[in-house]
Interface confidence: low
């Protein structure tokens, strides 16, 4: 009769390292001891009639083990193969290139040391969760490679690379090691240069802003840009908005900066550079200055206007160029009231590499005087109807424009430009008195109050001064305008005084 | 060194306007972002607005939309806001400070310029 | 917008005490920043980034929090740390500032 010997359990996977709890036996009537032959660690726990118990330690490769024992002078043996799964120690994707340009191949490299049973180990490579490459592990340690199209979509994706042990047959499940992710940067660096705004002309210890854009560029946000004046570096704000990066600085010239300079923007992205030049003339512009003798006069002064500009500057003082054309001018008038306010005007051009700078200044004059109280702007007489609504108006001319007070009696005010009930009270002659730092003047005032009943009369008298009135006054405007046009005459035999007298004066 | 120097105190009717200047020196104007904030008496700090002195663009705490309206000169390199329709409510100190990027925040600040709305 | 509150409003602490403040975001924040007010006078930036300490404040102050909770920490009070204390976001607009803790010498 033949008899057996049982090892259980029957060919076990466990993970590399474990214990295993192994029991022989047998249905052969003997007592005889049962032996568990194996290089592995072992330790009797219990046994009896026709079977033994083990425990294995520390089991960390695959290994038969055979169980034995003697029946009817023979011995009968049992056996069991042991199989030993482990994760792999190390599983690394290699470092990506720090900058990948879109449109170009890489290639993601993954390592992978340890792990068995090797038949059951894939290593797979990921972008995101997606799987770009599934292969076996073969050597040890095993390398798996896939090509890669970079894409911008890529652009902070991260890559990994995973292993998957596969134990579903032997009922213990599929078991992942997965790398450390790395993440790829993508971009995209167009062949043209940046568009660089700059000034052509920059004067010294002026600003100006300076402008460096370039489109197409991916990620923008990465981009980093120089932007220079000379050896100078500007301070630039960089904002990007979609693909466009756009970098703004502002220019100043220094004065040892003074010549033909260059305005430079690098943009760098992905250890690539693009490069834009513009040329730039620094140049020192001082002036015009116009000065007058004195900003502020009485009527009748002499007044000296005189502008200066830049030594290689050309003048013009209130339309007129500078005889000889150069950098100086000056015009002498006297002053009159008519003047006051008068703007002088002085434009200087300067030539810079071909092109003309203008500069102008403007400077007022302020002539002081009066005051004035005249007929026009003052009535002497007014004559009206009790009870009627009047605004008596007197107007005083002067600079600064005086005080005007018009009393009667040195105490009874006439309410100007105010709108008044006319009563008897307000009939009487005014003293109206204009007053400023200039001076004083006075005038008399006759307020006339008609009673209803004087109507008629009134009427008729008013009419017949109105008359008069005008009559005189034309006589008074003809004499004017002769006595005027005899002034004139006399003073273009002395040399008027308000001609323009432009002149260079001596370096 | 980096200064805020701002304008002096305003006493202001209601319903008037008032505008405060913040000049700076000491760095480019036009690069850093200038913030407005607001603290009455005794209270905490509100945030107003910002100007980018650069572009001018202006970006405000909506609760202060038609209360401020921040402008910027950068040939004087001056920051101002004018306040309107004033009432007690605007009474307080406001106070200009310079964004100096994530990883300083608001690292200059001015010294203050207290208005006082009273009629 | 994000409210951010301070706890506690009013604190008070001897010298040679650990002080501990916090500041609670309505919604997550990447980072924030803490600021020291003295009475008449503008607030100083005191801690940036979280837990970054500005020029010139000593190194018994700390700061500490991710997400939506901060804290500033005093390891040792001393007199001239009495102040009010603001915390700042500008995760989105508007920028905000909580309340302020005040904190008092005992």
């Known amino acids: 009769q033949e008899f057996l010997l049982r090892v259980e359990p029957q060919n076990p996977v466990l993970s590399a390292g474990g214990s295993l709890f192994v029991n022989c036996s047998t249905d052969c009537p003997s007592s005889e001891k049962i032996a568990l032959e194996t290089s592995l660690s072992k330790e009797l726990v219990a046994s009896g009639m026709g079977w033994a118990a083990f425990n294995l330690s520390n089991v960390t490769g695959n290994s038969r083990i055979l169980c034995s024992v003697y029946c009817n002078g023979s011995q009968i043996t049992g056996s069991s193969n042991i199989t030993v799964y482990g994760l792999p120690e190390r599983v690394e994707l290699a470092p990506l290139p720090p900058w990948q340009p879109v449109g170009q191949n890489f290639t993601l490299r993954c390592q992978v040391e340890g792990g068995s049973p090797r038949t059951s180990l894939t290593v797979v490579l990921l972008r995101w969760e997606e799987e770009l490459s599934r292969q076996p592990a073969v050597e040890e340690p095993a390398e798996v490679t896939a090509t890669v199209l970079a894409s911008r979509d890529d652009h902070g994706a991260p890559f990994s690379c995973r292993t998957e042990l596969d134990m579903q047959p032997q009922g213990l499940g599929l078991f992942v090691n997965t790398s450390a992710p790395r993440q790829l940067r993508t971009f995209v660096l167009p062949v043209t240069p940046p568009r660089l705004v700059a000034p052509r002309f920059l004067e010294v210890e002026t600003s100006w802003p300076v402008d460096c854009t370039l489109d197409g560029l991916f990620p923008a946000s990465e981009a980093q840009v120089y932007l220079a004046l000379g050896d100078q570096m500007l301070n630039a704000t960089v904002m990007n908005h979609g693909d466009t990066l756009t970098a703004t600085a502002t220019a100043t010239a220094r004065a040892d900066q003074e010549g033909a300079r260059e305005i430079v923007c690098n943009v760098t992205l992905g250890g690539e550079r693009r490069e834009a030049r513009e040329n730039l003339t620094v140049f020192s512009f001082l002036g015009p200055i116009v000065n007058l003798t004195k900003p502020e006069v009485s009527e009748g002064t002499e007044v000296t206007v005189k502008c200066e500009a830049h030594p290689r500057a050309k003048v013009t003082l209130n339309g007129v160029p500078a005889q000889p054309l150069g950098p100086r001018a000056q015009l002498l008038l006297k002053a009159t009231p008519e003047d006051n306010g008068r703007s002088f005007s002085c434009s200087a051009t300067l030539e810079v590499a071909g092109q003309l700078i203008h500069k102008n200044q403007t400077r007022e004059l302020r002539v002081l005087y009066g005051p004035r109280l005249d007929e026009r702007d003052c009535p002497g007489n007014w004559t009206w109807p009790e009870n009627s609504q009047q605004t008596p108006m007197c107007q005083a001319w002067g600079n600064p424009l005086p005080e005007l007070k018009c009393l009667k009696d040195g105490t009874f005010p006439l309410p100007i430009g105010e709108s008044v009930t006319v009563t008897r009270d307000l009939e009487g002659t005014y003293l109206c008195r204009a007053r400023s730092t200039q001076g004083e003047v006075t005038r008399k005032v006759t307020v006339n109050v008609l009673s209803p009943r004087y109507e008629i009369v009134i009427i008729t008298v008013v009419a017949a001064a109105v008359i008069m009135g005008t009559a005189g006054l034309s006589t008074y405007l003809y004499n004017r305008q002769r006595k005027i046009k005899k002034y004139r005459l006399q003073q273009a035999q002395k040399g008027t005084p308000m001609k323009p007298n432009t002149q260079a004066t001596p370096p | 060194q980096v200064q805020l120097q701002q304008s002096g105190a305003e006493l202001a009717d209601p319903g008037a306007s008032v505008k405060m200047s913040c000049k700076a020196s000491?760095?480019?104007?036009?690069?850093?972002?200038m913030h407005w904030v607001k603290q009455r008496p005794g209270q905490g700090l509100e945030w107003i607005g910002y100007?980018?002195?650069?572009?001018?663009?202006?970006e405000y705490n909506q609760r202060f939309q038609d209360k401020a309206t921040l402008t910027a000169d950068k040939s004087s390199s001056t920051a101002y806001m004018q306040l309107s329709s004033l009432t007690s409510e605007d009474s307080a100190v406001y106070y200009c400070?310079?964004?100096?990027?994530?990883?300083?925040?608001?690292?200059?600040w001015g010294q203050g310029t207290s208005v006082t709305v009273s009629s | 917008q994000i409210v951010l509150t301070q706890s506690p409003a009013l604190m008070s602490a001897s010298p040679g005490e650990k002080v501990t403040m916090t500041c609670s975001a309505s919604?997550?924040?990447?980072?924030i920043y803490w600021y020291q007010q003295k009475p008449r006078s503008s607030p100083k930036p005191w801690i940036y980034l979280t837990s970054n300490l500005a020029s010139g404040v000593p190194a018994r102050f700390s700061g500490s929090g991710s997400g939506a909770s901060y804290s500033l920490t005093i390891s040792i009070m001393e007199a001239e740390d009495a102040a009010t204390y603001y915390c700042?976001?500008?995760?989105?607009?508007?920028?905000?500032f909580g309340a302020g803790t005040k904190l008092e010498l005992k």
């Open positions: 000491g760095y480019t104007f036009t690069v850093y972002w």
């Open positions: 400070a310079r964004w100096g990027g994530n990883s300083y925040g608001l690292d200059y």
């Open positions: 100007i980018n002195p650069n572009t001018d663009y202006t």
């Open positions: 919604s997550s924040v990447s980072y």
């Open positions: 700042q976001q500008w995760k989105s607009i508007p920028l905000t």
